[in-house]
């Protein structure tokens, strides 16, 4: 990212180019790859971020057991098609005309098909389970301190309304963060749980999407919380449609 002029940068998205050619000569920032103008006062949608990334010149437990319908993003990176609002289009296709349906976080939810594949609607991911394992520490973290710190993080860094952080579970060394957001709950201006989870995932990997901020320095009562493994499960409002072959694989 190159600053176009003093303070003409996008604090919430380093995968942008900003220049003083917005209305009234004001700073305007556009996402790499799509050329779409982005609102730098909030998180950029995951679809536009993925597009920019692809175009850049690079048992009795307190823990939740993911549902049988939970999806994990096993397909990795791809260059997505985004709709006019920057959200994922329900149907994604690659250069070789292989197509599949995705959910609102861009994770494949059907078998792959050809150009005749129909994806009637973008199915909303309403429940995200972020499963973390932290590095060994002298002792376990205090659960309520951990809970408070993670809630603060999602509220302040990712601007996610606290009501969407449904729960924080802890059983050393595993931490689980549950995000829940139904279509009916999400008001205009609310950060999407999928976008917040993606920013968090990139932060945890040391690949912060924020402009010029230091990396994520997570501390619980002054003790560093260092994550050594992350798994994210996505639960859709309508269960995914995979063939039995995949389910038994």
């Amino acid at each position: 990212h190159t600053a176009a002029q003093d303070n003409c940068t996008c604090p919430t998205n380093k995968m942008t180019v900003c220049s003083p050619d917005g209305p009234g000569g004001r700073c305007q920032c556009r996402a790499l790859g799509s050329g779409m103008a982005v609102d730098c006062s909030t998180l950029t949608s995951k679809c536009l971020l993925l597009k920019a990334r692809m175009s850049a010149p690079k048992n009795a437990r307190t823990l939740v057991r993911p549902s049988e319908h939970a999806l994990v993003d096993n397909d990795g990176l791809y260059d997505p098609d985004c709709d006019p609002e920057g959200r994922f289009k329900a149907r994604q296709c690659n250069q070789t005309s292989v197509c599949w349906c995705v959910n609102s976080v861009g994770v494949r939810r059907t078998d792959k098909g050809d150009l005749s594949l129909r994806c009637d609607e973008l199915v909303r991911t309403h429940h995200i389970l972020i499963d973390l394992r932290h590095r060994p520490t002298a002792g376990a973290f205090n659960h309520s301190d951990l809970d408070a710190e993670l809630r603060r993080l999602f509220r302040e860094r990712y601007r996610l309304h606290p009501k969407f952080v449904a729960a924080v579970h802890y059983e050393q060394p595993t931490i689980q963060i549950e995000l829940r957001q139904n279509t009916s709950q999400k008001a205009a201006g609310d950060v999407d749980i999928g976008d917040a989870a993606y920013y968090f995932e990139r932060d945890i990997k040391g690949e912060s999407l924020f402009q010029g901020r230091g990396g994520l320095d997570l501390r619980v009562r002054g003790e560093p919380l260092q994550v050594e493994r992350t798994l994210i499960y996505y639960l859709d409002e309508i269960p995914p449609k995979f063939s039995m072959k995949r389910l038994t694989a």
Epitope: A4, S19, D21, G35, D39
Partner: antibody, heavy 116, light 111 residues
């Protein structure tokens, strides 16, 4: 004052390449996108792509991907548009403009004629 | 790609009368804050000249008889009192997403 001065007219044979230059002055070259637009004789305007000289970032109209190459030399404040595998339908006036959409300053245009 | 459709293709208006050119985008090009729509004037043998940026912002040096309005998919360029020097082809262009396409143009003549 802001000025964009383009290179002179070119006559090329089908299959050849052409490289049009656009020298900017009167503003900070690295701060603004430079867009490229073409206009075939008697036709409308067609957006080719744009480049951000401050980082070398480029966007292309899918129609020109693989044939058009946009570059910029910040030391001379000059942007370039190279079009390869020319065909007769590429005969047009090629313009550079400052800005993404809503180009506020334009070059005078470069006529590229493709003829055997 | 977003398709920009201008109407009419050509227009003849008497001097001093109002001229109105419309542009329709195949999808919305507006947010709650801005519309990513721009208007140009092009005279024969000259490059296009930016008249209006972001649907309604008049460029400096452009006479105030020119105005722009609209949001979403429908936009209008209005010349309140046509002058002889306004004879030209007018183009709309969006800058919502790549590619930043233009309308086909509207030729404005004196009646």
């Amino acid at each position: 004052q802001v000025q964009l001065v383009q290179s002179g007219a070119e006559v090329k044979k089908p299959g050849a390449s052409v490289k049009v230059s656009c020298k900017a002055s009167g503003y900070t070259f690295t701060n603004y996108w430079i867009g490229w637009v073409r206009q075939a004789p008697g036709q409308g305007l067609e957006w080719i792509g744009d480049i951000y000289p401050g980082g070398g970032y480029t966007n292309y109209n899918e129609k020109f991907k693989g044939r058009a190459t946009l570059t910029a030399d910040t030391s001379t404040s000059t942007a370039y548009m190279e079009l390869s595998s020319l065909r007769s339908e590429d005969t047009a006036v090629y313009y550079c403009a400052r800005g993404t959409g809503g180009g506020d300053y334009w070059g005078q245009g470069t006529l590229v004629t493709v003829s055997s | 790609d977003i398709v920009m459709t201008q109407s009419p293709d050509s227009l003849a208006v008497s001097l001093g009368e109002r001229a109105t050119i419309n542009c329709r985008a195949s999808q919305s090009v507006s947010t709650s804050s801005y519309s990513y729509m721009h208007w140009y004037q092009q005279k024969p043998g000259q490059p296009p000249k930016l008249l209006i940026k972001y649907a309604s912002n008049l460029e400096s040096g452009v006479p105030d008889r020119f105005s722009g309005s609209g949001s979403g998919t429908d936009f209008t360029l209005t010349i309140s009192s046509l002058q002889a020097e306004d004879v030209a082809v007018y183009y709309c262009q969006h800058s919502w997403e790549i590619p930043y396409t233009f309308g086909q143009g509207t030729k404005l003549e004196i009646k």
